[in-house]
Interface confidence: low
């Protein structure tokens, strides 16, 4: 039975029964977040031979080996990967060996085996026999090999049963467990797989086979599987599917996309049954299963469920890649970014029509709107309050709208509004009125002749804060209601805030002509009640962190000696409250006598306050039965047992200081200080670990169904 389109087993180990009849998992297999240690011995899935995507194991308590669960898992194809990996074993607290003794091939992708405190038999597996390239494998933070005492079958009795290969200049026996060797095929087979009896399989077999030189006896196929036979290519009238098998047209027609109920069905293109047409192609009619090349950019209608799509980063712009018609409103709010104009052009440059309104505000990174290089029509079917369909507010570096000599843009309905664009000439706005056909629609205040194109700005009134309240991740501030001569001229307030370890920031920190801006900005509307003081709750802040905050009043033009009059506050420095620290790092214990343990650790990465003390708890554990499976007498010494710290291997506490040559003198002394390059490499390594862990958590933690 083919199972799919991906199996996620979590929380309850009995869900494993879903794998009972699976021979191939078409998709991924996740086994994760089973926190109660269970006895897995009664669970065995000998039918499972192939996983077409990847295998992910994460925090499964009580599972000591995968060999009993998946004794015949032979191939992980890696058709789709989990963060570049086809096999991920992460934070498996009780796993003692991988034990996948029949795993012969990982077709694509690398492996990541990390933070498995009790995991051994890693140095005894030659991954180069399973993967094409081992350079991207990441095996870190598991039990140190010298504490494992890994012994391959027969070594103790001096009758070794396993074959040897060289890894890192070390020629040694290769095995998965104490009683399972790593299978190697005779050199005469070359790249071909072999049977248990070392007979070479058919060239189209992958991993293994039940009979030699027979393309119907393969455990898995090198290329494609069709009607019981491994074939180099799919036969006529069949189509490649999911990277491993051939299906007919009817099968493809009735596949329903697992991702969305709103998508059209699968298509057949270039001999493959796929979810949608590839780039540069479009369906030949909405019901069609076939793709035709687009003339020019492919028409693509994109719709935002919430009606308004906010573009505040390259990531959000990415969602519009390839869109030619945008059904909804665009709110562009780009405050910073590297190479932002070309990135935005890449993702938004094909948009021709926006059915609603376009609003550009606080986009200090923008110098021009030319990234919307194909925009020709704003329908204005939905408008902002005041009947605006093109609204440009507070863009500090905006100098050009479009090149009007080469641009034909129509605004079908609605007015334009321009304010607080100090580098945008009013003549440029008037030109846009003419080109877009909106001349005569705007009223006098819609195009502000004083604060558009006016670099100089004289803010003379001071806003005073009236209260501040903090919690561990929130700051509430209020300030005096600013009362300009004409109360109607006050539009709103903008609060600027950022982390400030030292009290030395200025309003213009990190802001330059390229649009870099280190301040976060929040708009605050006026309280409806004129007697209520305005305020804001800033949330999502870091505990025990000092922030700088200031507020600006957003006002209409008030002429006073030919200057724009406004108001802003001084910069206020305020610290959030302390919180619970993150866990101490690199916990390490060793015994220096029969009645003592020495425990060491590093401070938490996020102290979230001033640390005053640590609490150490311990309890007696039953003797680990796994110890008795090894004959440690055959080793030179019995290693001191410790649990891996889950990050990197650290030397024993009890060892003597290293003897190294330092500063030209010989003799015992401390290790030489790390070079800048080493420090940088360590920093990048730590960063890489963090990025992967975040990716893992974001991928697998989902809200519990209500």
């Amino acid at each position: 039975e083919i199972c799919g389109p991906g199996i996620d087993i979590r929380n309850d180990y009995q869900q494993l029964k879903r794998l009972e009849n699976c021979t191939v998992i078409e998709g991924y297999l996740h086994i994760l977040l089973i926190s109660k240690a269970e006895d897995y011995r009664s669970y065995r899935f000998p039918k499972l031979t192939v996983i077409t995507e990847y295998l992910l194991l994460f925090r499964v308590a009580g599972l000591e080996s995968l060999g009993d669960l998946f004794p015949n898992l032979t191939v992980i194809r890696g058709w789709k990967l989990f963060y570049n990996y086809a096999l991920v074993i992460f934070e498996m607290t009780n796993l003692k060996d991988i034990g996948l003794y029949n795993l012969r091939n990982i077709t694509r992708g690398a492996i990541r085996i990390e933070k498995n405190a009790d995991l051994c038999y890693l140095s005894t597996v030659d991954w180069s026999l399973i993967l094409d390239a081992v350079s991207n494998n990441y095996i870190v933070g598991n039990k140190p090999p010298k504490e494992c005492g890994d012994l391959c079958p027969g070594t103790m009795e001096e009758k070794p049963m396993c074959e040897k290969t060289t890894i890192n200049n070390e020629y040694n026996y290769r095995c998965w467990t104490t009683n399972r060797c790593q299978k190697m095929c005779p050199s005469t087979c070359g790249k071909r797989a072999c049977t248990e009896n070392n007979e070479c399989c058919h060239p189209e077999c992958l991993g293994s086979c039940s009979a030699p030189d027979n393309d119907t006896a393969c455990v898995a196929c090198r290329h494609y599987y069709y009607a019981g036979v491994c074939v180099p290519a799919c036969p006529p009238n069949t189509y490649r599917f999911e990277g491993w098998r051939c299906v007919d047209r009817d099968f493809c027609a009735n596949i329903l996309s697992a991702e969305s109920s709103d998508s059209e069905g699968f298509v057949i293109h270039d001999g493959e049954c796929m979810q949608e047409c590839p780039s540069g192609f479009i369906r030949n009619g909405s019901q069609s299963m076939y793709c035709i090349p687009c003339e020019g950019p492919c028409p693509k209608v994109c719709e935002e469920e919430k009606k308004t799509k906010t573009i505040d980063s390259v990531t959000s712009a990415q969602m519009l890649q390839g869109c030619t018609i945008f059904k909804g409103n665009l709110l562009i709010n780009i405050r910073r970014g590297n190479n932002i104009a070309s990135e935005l052009e890449n993702f938004m440059g094909l948009i021709e029509v926006v059915t609603g309104y376009v609003k550009i505000r606080h986009s200090h990174a923008l110098v021009s709107l030319s990234f919307l290089k194909n925009l020709r029509l704003i329908l204005g079917e939905e408008q902002l309050e005041g009947n605006y369909s093109f609204y440009v507010l507070d863009n500090q570096n905006l100098q050009q709208l479009w090149d009007w000599d080469h641009r034909n843009l129509t605004i079908k309905a609605g007015k334009m509004y321009f304010a607080f664009n100090p580098k945008l000439c009013v003549s440029e706005i008037y030109r846009m009125e003419e080109v877009t056909g909106t001349k005569g629609r705007q009223s006098k205040g819609d195009i502000n002749t004083r604060n558009n194109g006016e670099r100089a700005s004289c803010e003379s009134d001071v806003l005073h804060f009236t209260s501040t309240t903090t919690s561990k991740n929130r700051i509430i501030i209020t300030w005096h209601r600013y009362r300009p001569p004409d109360y109607r001229d006050l539009i709103s307030f903008t609060v600027y805030y950022k982390e400030a370890p030292f009290k030395n920031v200025t309003e213009y920190d990190g802001q330059d002509a390229c649009g870099s801006n280190s301040w976060n900005m929040v708009d605050v509307d006026l309280p409806p009640n004129k007697d209520v003081e305005p305020g804001i709750l800033l949330h999502g802040l870091k505990p025990w962190t000092q922030y700088a905050v200031y507020v600006k009043a957003v006002t209409l033009t008030m002429v006073e000696n030919d200057h724009i009059r406004g108001a802003k506050s001084e910069i206020l420095y305020i610290r959030t409250n302390a919180s619970v620290p993150s866990i101490p790092l690199d916990v390490l214990s060793a015994s220096n006598s029969s009645s003592q343990l020495i425990v060491k650790w590093n401070p938490p990465s996020l102290p979230n306050g001033n640390l005053s003390y640590y609490i150490v708890r311990w309890q007696r554990q039953p003797q680990d039965g796994y110890l008795y499976r090894h004959n440690y007498c055959s080793k030179d010494k019995i290693p001191i047992r410790k649990y891996a710290d889950g990050t990197i291997d650290i030397e024993e506490v009890t060892e003597n200081p290293k003897t190294e040559v330092c500063g030209g003198e010989k003799g015992p002394c401390c290790a030489c200080p790390k070079t800048e390059a080493e420090k940088q490499a360590e920093k990048e390594e730590a960063e890489y670990r963090k990025v992967f862990e975040n990716f893992l958590h974001n991928s697998i933690f989902v809200p519990r169904p209500e």
């Epitope: 009735n254 329903l256 697992a258 998508s263 909405s286």
Partner: antibody, heavy 121, light 107 residues
Framework: QIQLVQSGPDLKKPGETVKISCKAS????????MNWVKQAPGKDLKWMGW????????TYADDFKGRFAFSLETSASTAYLQINNLKNEDTATYFC??????????????WGAGTTVTVSS | DIQMTQTTSSLSASLGDRVTISCRAS??????LNWYQQKPDGSVKLLIY???RLHSGVPSRFSGSGSGTDYSLTISNLEQEDIATYFC?????????FGGGTKLEIK
């Protein structure tokens, strides 16, 4: 205005044949599949299958293989359901329904008013 | 085939009431659950697709929720025109299957 207009009620004897029509208007007929749904008196709805209006290729649910046939008259934007060798249990109201959003019709956003077929000797 | 069960075949409520109609699938249908309204004259129309998405033109007093195998349709403020039979339908796996229907009446 998007609508599906079905033919009127029909009274037939067992063993006879009935052909129900469903005329589409207000949208491109060949862009969206046509589904057929049966509702026996006092019973729930039962999906019979669909026809690809682009290719004319029908797909039948297991219970409706054999005596039932879907066909098209594309020039008239009309789909047909024909039931041969009528039985008493074919007495029901038959709806045509089109999914204007999804090729295989995970949901049907346009429905005909239904055609009641009565089979009685 | 996936069986769809509407345990309540008929339901009486007063105008202005909040009414909830439930539907259960025999297996996980991954939110591919749609709701239809059949008026006494026999006409059928789509109300909600993909568990909670309101079809265009449907009043906002209708809402849907659920996940896995259990789903429900809620009418927040019952009006006279809502008197009808309501069917659920799964769109996860062919053949599409409908629930037995829940007939809504006025007390």
């Amino acid at each position: 205005q998007i609508q599906l207009v079905q033919s009127g009620p029909d009274l037939k004897k067992p063993g006879e044949t009935v052909k129900i029509s469903c005329k589409a208007s207000g949208y491109t007929f060949t862009n969206h599949g046509m589904n057929w749904v049966k509702q026996a008196p006092g019973k729930d709805l039962k999906w019979m299958g669909w026809i690809n209006t682009n290719t004319g290729e029908p797909t039948y649910a297991d219970d409706f293989k054999g005596r039932f046939a879907f066909s098209l008259e594309t020039s008239a934007s009309t789909a047909y359901l024909q039931i041969n060798n009528l039985k008493n249990e074919d007495t029901a109201t038959y709806f045509c329904a089109s999914p204007l959003y999804y090729r295989n019709g995970r949901y049907f956003d346009v429905w005909g008013a239904g055609t009641t077929v009565t089979v009685s000797s | 085939d996936i069986q769809m069960t509407q345990t309540t075949s008929s339901l009486s409520a007063s105008l202005g009431d909040r009414v909830t109609i439930s539907c259960r699938a025999s297996q996980d249908i991954s939110n591919y659950l749609n709701w239809y309204q059949q008026k006494p004259d026999g006409s059928v129309k789509l109300l909600i697709y993909y568990t909670s998405r309101l079809h265009s033109g449907v009043p906002s007093r209708f809402s849907g929720s659920g996940s896995g195998t259990d789903y429900s349709l809620t009418i927040s403020n019952l009006e006279q025109e809502d008197i009808a039979t309501y069917f659920c339908q799964q769109g996860k796996t062919l053949p599409w299957t409908f629930g037995g229907g829940t007939k809504l009446e006025i007390k």
